[in-house]
Amino acid sequence: QRFAQAQQQLPLESLGWDVAELQLNHTGPQQDPRLYWQGGPALGRSFLHGPELDKGQLRIHRDGIYMVHIQVTLAICSSTTASRHHPTTLAVGICSPASRSISLLRLSFHQGCTIASQRLTPLARGDTLCTNLTGTLLPSRNTDETFFGVQWVRP
Amino acid sequence: QRFAQAQQQLPLESLGWDVAELQLNHTGPQQDPRLYWQGGPALGRSFLHGPELDKGQLRIHRDGIYMVHIQVTLAICSSTTASRHHPTTLAVGICSPASRSISLLRLSFHQGCTIASQRLTPLARGDTLCTNLTGTLLPSRNTDETFFGVQWVRP
Amino acid sequence: QRFAQAQQQLPLESLGWDVAELQLNHTGPQQDPRLYWQGGPALGRSFLHGPELDKGQLRIHRDGIYMVHIQVTLAICSSTTASRHHPTTLAVGICSPASRSISLLRLSFHQGCTIASQRLTPLARGDTLCTNLTGTLLPSRNTDETFFGVQWVRP
């Protein structure tokens, strides 16, 4: 019985299973397109098991292939607003280290008020993910409308 | 060899890997915004391995962090229809037990006819997930257009 | 220590964890609605661990339940373009063997320029997945805008 319990821990400890789900804290100042995230049980249903936050940006702690997902809903938005303020674009990418900087996922809002997507991507320990929202509209901070997360899938 | 096979069962039996993918059965009466789901190999490609259906709503059987995903396509829909019938909104949440009631995921259709999203969230044994579609438009029952699922990710 | 390392390999070798993330290579000729994919580290962040490509289509090598995800962004697109060229539709399905042919996931662009979705589905060794884009608009080949992937979830 004790042996089985020991095995049960293996995937979590040895294999990883790093996972994080974040909620929006705030947007940066006008010339900083990044969204700043927060996570932790005290904040609701957000959490970090492995990855960490560095000044509101998500930093990876374990090499592997990750499923990255995001949903962003614009505040006070209608299809008219969205098209009037076009282009509003969201991009998720590795922003540091600079040598690994790359855009991983990009979507425009066009006449919609929400974007949601996901993708598999290799990430390395120390990679910091940034989510850039360009345009003049601000995102909703409702935790069921705007969130960002990663899930370790395999080495 | 037998030992290796025993280990191979551990993640499924001990660790979980509960998973379900459901197809739409029907919508509720006018004052019930819930979508009613069904699943099982006899119905096509839907299935339940761990979670169960309780009067068309998905009930969780194992504590853990889950990836919840959904796609809903409106029937007889064009961007004109969608905007004329706005707001049409889909929300996925824990609807019982009442003490844990919360909206997990929310999207509006605006000028689109399909919404699709996913998120990581902690769920507990006994949590029942409801998917509420508010508005006058009905969802397509095509199994490749409307579906709802959960995947256990880690304890 | 060697024992723990041996266990660590089990999920990868014995249990699967097949995974692939592909980028768009090209579209087919006018009467072929299929998108042709490519993957491998030399191409950027795409990869195949288990599944293989067969003339640009993804072939599954291990039975199991998979998470299938896709994002397609139309090139040179605005909400006006998208609605003028409507209907533009993306469908992901099993296209061979013919006996298992079925549509798994379908979305229309309506007034949007990007679709993104995901679903859980059982797939069998030898299943080939095709992604059909119908309409006159072409997809973007930017690797952060158009991608397609699968992740083995459980037997």
Epitope: H26, T27, G28, P29, Q30, Q31, D32, Y36, A75, I76, T81, H85, T136, L137, L138, S140, R141, N142 | - | -
Partner: antibody, heavy 119, light 107 residues
Framework: QIQLVQSGSELKKPGASVKVSCKAS????????MNWVRQAPGQGLEWMGW????????TYADGFTGRFVFSLDTSASTAYLQISSLKAEDTAVYFC????????????WGQGTLVTVSS | DIQMTQSPSSLSASVGDRVTITCQAS??????LNWYQQKPGKAPKLLIY???RLHAGVPSRFSGSGSGTDYTFTISSLQPEDIATYFC?????????FGQGTKLEIK
């Protein structure tokens, strides 16, 4: 510490032009946008627009296009507001303002420049 | 544009009083609401941002609440140095707009 120091009061005749300066210190000038806010005598605050100090691109609110121009001298860490063809109704205190961490939240303000337009 | 309606336009209170100012937006502003204090001849000073977050160095007697279109600013115990005009500002979309101000005086 972070400071925004504006030029002194101006008395101008209708039809003339005026250029108000806002000198920034204590931070990297090109990292933060500069906003302009107008306050007519005894009135409320009106956001006029902002200038991207990295690209130089200005954004004007409705009612502040044409006669109002935002500009920069990045080497001097200074932003400018120029108003041409002055009218009596342009009489106001003009403030420059800057955000810190949060979008559209103004933590730092210049002391204000009173522009009086009178014949 | 989003209109911000502040009330009252002026009010008189005694030292130690609880003072409340309201701000109503013409549409939902998703809690992107800030409050500023302005003393005569001075620049505005940020007190509260994002509806209820207290700016660094601002005394805890100042607070904010609200959601949707309706927001409230409160001084729990009025002090002589609080005599000023207070402005709300929506920060959800351009153009940014302010309330017309509430002038606070001591009785």
């Amino acid at each position: 510490q972070i400071q925004l120091v504006q030029s002194g009061s101006e008395l101008k005749k209708p039809g003339a032009s005026v250029k108000v300066s806002c000198k920034a210190s204590g931070y990297t000038f090109t990292n933060y946008g500069m906003n302009w806010v107008r306050q007519a005598p005894g009135q409320g605050l009106e956001w006029m627009g902002w200038i991207n100090t990295y690209t130089g691109e200005p954004t004007y609110a409705d009612g502040f296009t044409g006669r109002f121009v935002f500009s920069l001298d990045t080497s001097a860490s200074t932003a400018y507001l120029q108003i041409s063809s002055l009218k009596a109704e342009d009489t106001a205190v003009y403030f420059c303002a800057r955000e810190e961490d949060y979008r559209y939240v103004f933590n730092y303000w210049g002391q204000g420049t009173l522009v009086t337009v009178s014949s | 544009d989003i209109q911000m309606t502040q009330s009252p336009s002026s009010l008189s209170a005694s030292v130690g009083d609880r003072v409340t100012i309201t701000c109503q937006a013409s549409q939902d502003i998703s809690n992107y609401l800030n409050w500023y204090q302005q003393k005569p001849g001075k620049a505005p000073k940020l007190l509260i941002y994002d509806t209820s977050r207290l700016h660094a160095g601002v005394p805890s007697r100042f607070s904010g609440s609200g959601s949707g279109t309706d927001y409230t600013f409160t001084i729990s115990s009025l002090q002589p140095e609080d005599i000023a005009t207070y402005f709300c500002q929506q920060g959800v979309t351009l153009p940014l707009t302010f309330g017309q101000g509430t002038k606070l005086e001591i009785k």
